[in-house]
């Protein structure tokens, strides 16, 4: 996990999230996403 400080005085937390592709489709393997401020963006 990474934490970034900004001049505005608030912090944004990054967290890598890993999902299994087969849970949402027919593919195998892992899907890696990034959660920023509580929202998965990738």
């Amino acid at each position: 996990d990474a934490e970034f400080r900004h001049d505005s005085g608030y912090e944004v937390h990054h967290q890598k999230l890993v999902f299994f592709a087969e849970d949402v489709g027919s593919n195998k393997g892992a899907i890696i996403g990034l959660m920023v401020g509580g929202v998965v963006i990738a």
């Epitope: 967290q15 999230l17 890993v18 087969e22 849970d23 195998k28």
Partner: nanobody, 124 residues
Framework: EVQLVESGGGLVQAGDSLRLSCTAS????????IGWFCQAPGKEREFVAA????????YYADSAKGRFTISRDNAKNTVYLQMNSLKPEDTAVYAC?????????????????WGQGTQVTVSS
């Protein structure tokens, strides 16, 4: 819901191997992704590895890649963690946990059922 019991821990020498087992009872085993986590004294719980309900997908923490292998036998309702080339820094309590599908598998907050854990101690 599912219940989990771990076994296979113990005291080994550095470089040795262990195979941990996580046996489930209760609900349909294949409905759950299973993860292994470890917690060393005074440290936070860490993700080790996870496997999908079918066994077709796996994911490993960087520290486990190349040394640990997660697998499952759905006929026996059991998930295994084969641990090779063990190091003293692998010493920890290892616990398995079950997560509903579609949740992130590398974070402990996704897991709502936990086993009691099994102690692994690696001496130098």
């Amino acid at each position: 819901e599912v219940q989990l019991v771990e076994s296979g821990g113990g005291l080994v020498q550095a470089g040795d191997s262990l195979r941990l087992s996580c046996t489930a009872s209760g609900r349909t085993f294949t409905d759950y992704n299973i993860g292994w986590f470890c917690q060393a004294p005074g440290k936070e719980r860490e993700f080790v590895a996870a496997i999908s309900g079918s066994g077709g997908s796996t994911y490993y923490a960087d520290s486990a890649k190349g040394r640990f292998t997660i697998s499952r036998d759905n006929a026996k309702n059991t998930v295994y963690l084969q641990m090779n080339s063990l190091k003293p820094e692998d010493t920890a309590v290892y616990a398995c946990a079950a997560a509903q599908r579609r949740l992130a598998v590398n974070v402990d907050t996704s897991y709502n059922v936990w086993g009691q854990g099994t102690q692994v101690t690696v001496s130098s």
